[in-house]
């Protein structure tokens, strides 16, 4: 009886269960009753990352410097090239096809997580007791100055964008 289903790493063709080609190789000819599947290695600029019956290998991804991309990991016959973004930029998507500048956190917000080549800056509002008076991709919210430790008193309250203003204590009782 000809098979209707095949084992793992096999495929059914012409009533035969043929071996799939291993990662890094493409299909040249299907197996027959008497011969095994014929596979050939992908060329240097190509890859296949699964057991397959593809007749063409996939081209490695090109990390286009005009889009701010650079090679993070060179592709092999079994893996695609991994691109990342140049410093100051991050990927616009998971597949990292182009890059955009990291965003800055506006005054009143501080950096919760610094951007990487694949993720943007994460900002957080400065909580009570903290402030940020700059637009920055690196600076966290800073704590208000503690006037007491300087033997000073608060003359002007701080906000999420401004520090407290300290002044001398009123000596009049």
């Amino acid at each position: 009886e000809p098979p209707t289903a095949c084992r793992e790493k096999q495929y059914l063709i012409n009533s035969q269960c043929c071996s799939l080609c291993q990662p890094g190789q493409k299909l040249v000819s299907d197996c027959t009753e008497f011969t095994e599947t014929e596979c050939l290695p992908c060329s240097e600029s190509e890859f296949l990352d699964t057991w397959n019956r593809e007749t063409r290998c996939h081209q490695h991804k090109y990390c286009d410097p005009n889009l701010g991309l650079q090679v993070q990991q060179k592709g092999t016959s079994e893996t695609d090239t991994i691109c990342t973004c140049e410093e100051g930029l991050h990927c616009t998507s998971e597949s990292c096809e182009s890059c955009v500048p990291h965003r800055s956190c506006l005054p009143g917000f501080g950096v919760k997580q610094i951007a990487t080549g694949v993720s943007d800056t994460i900002c957080e509002p400065c909580p009570v007791g903290f402030f940020s008076n700059v637009s920055s991709a690196f600076e966290k919210c800073r704590p208000w100055t503690s006037c007491e430790t300087k033997d000073l008193v608060v003359q002007q309250a701080g906000t999420n964008k401004t520090d407290v203003v300290c002044g001398p204590q009123d000596r009049q009782r």
Partner: antibody, heavy 123, light 107 residues
Framework: EVQLVESGGGLVQPGGSLRLSCAAS????????MSWVRQAPGKGLEWVGF??????????EYAASVKGRFTISRDNSKNTLYLQMNSLRAEDTAVYYC??????????????WGQGTLVTVSS | DIQMTQSPSSLSASVGDRVTITCRAS??????LNWYQQKPGKAPKLLIY???RRDSGVPSRFSGSGSGTDYTLTISSLQPEDFATYFC?????????FGGGTKVEIK
Amino acid sequence: EVQLVESGGGLVQPGGSLRLSCAASGFTFSDYYMSWVRQAPGKGLEWVGFIRNKANGYTTEYAASVKGRFTISRDNSKNTLYLQMNSLRAEDTAVYYCARYGGLRQGWYFDVWGQGTLVTVSS
Amino acid sequence: DIQMTQSPSSLSASVGDRVTITCRASQDIRNYLNWYQQKPGKAPKLLIYYTSRRDSGVPSRFSGSGSGTDYTLTISSLQPEDFATYFCQQGKTLPWTFGGGTKVEIK
């Protein structure tokens, strides 16, 4: 011991018929593809045809030179392979060998041969 | 059909000689190449299958190599019992075809 023994050869007139037999022993006959190969006097080897095993429905394949004239069959209960030869021609004169066809997709080959039986087609 | 061309058709050699027989296919047979030995009045005997795999019981002086269309049978040190005719056979595509044979004779 694995063995193949052919019989049934002889002298036959052009246009005549002959049936060759091959008795197999020492292996599970129905598991194997079985083949006929012939050799004209002083010449090389020529594949005649084969019959598939039980798993592949006992179907047959033939060389173009004998297709439509020769029929391969088998009787698994008797562990015997047959070659029915009709419309015989002078060029069919040869020693006929029964051979077991074995192997996997990493290479198939004739691994067991009979001693051969001579068929002479002449008037 | 795939044509198999063997060379030489015959050769003379002495005991202890290294002997090489070649077989050329009319198209790529992807290593599906077998070698048989036949002595006068006897049936052929399988020596090597799938280019280089020796059948059980075949002495190690017999070896096979090749790829694509060109294949070789080598007898590293010819013994008296090796004087015979050798045939190659392709097993890639029906109909199975044999080379014309190489007769190894005593010098």
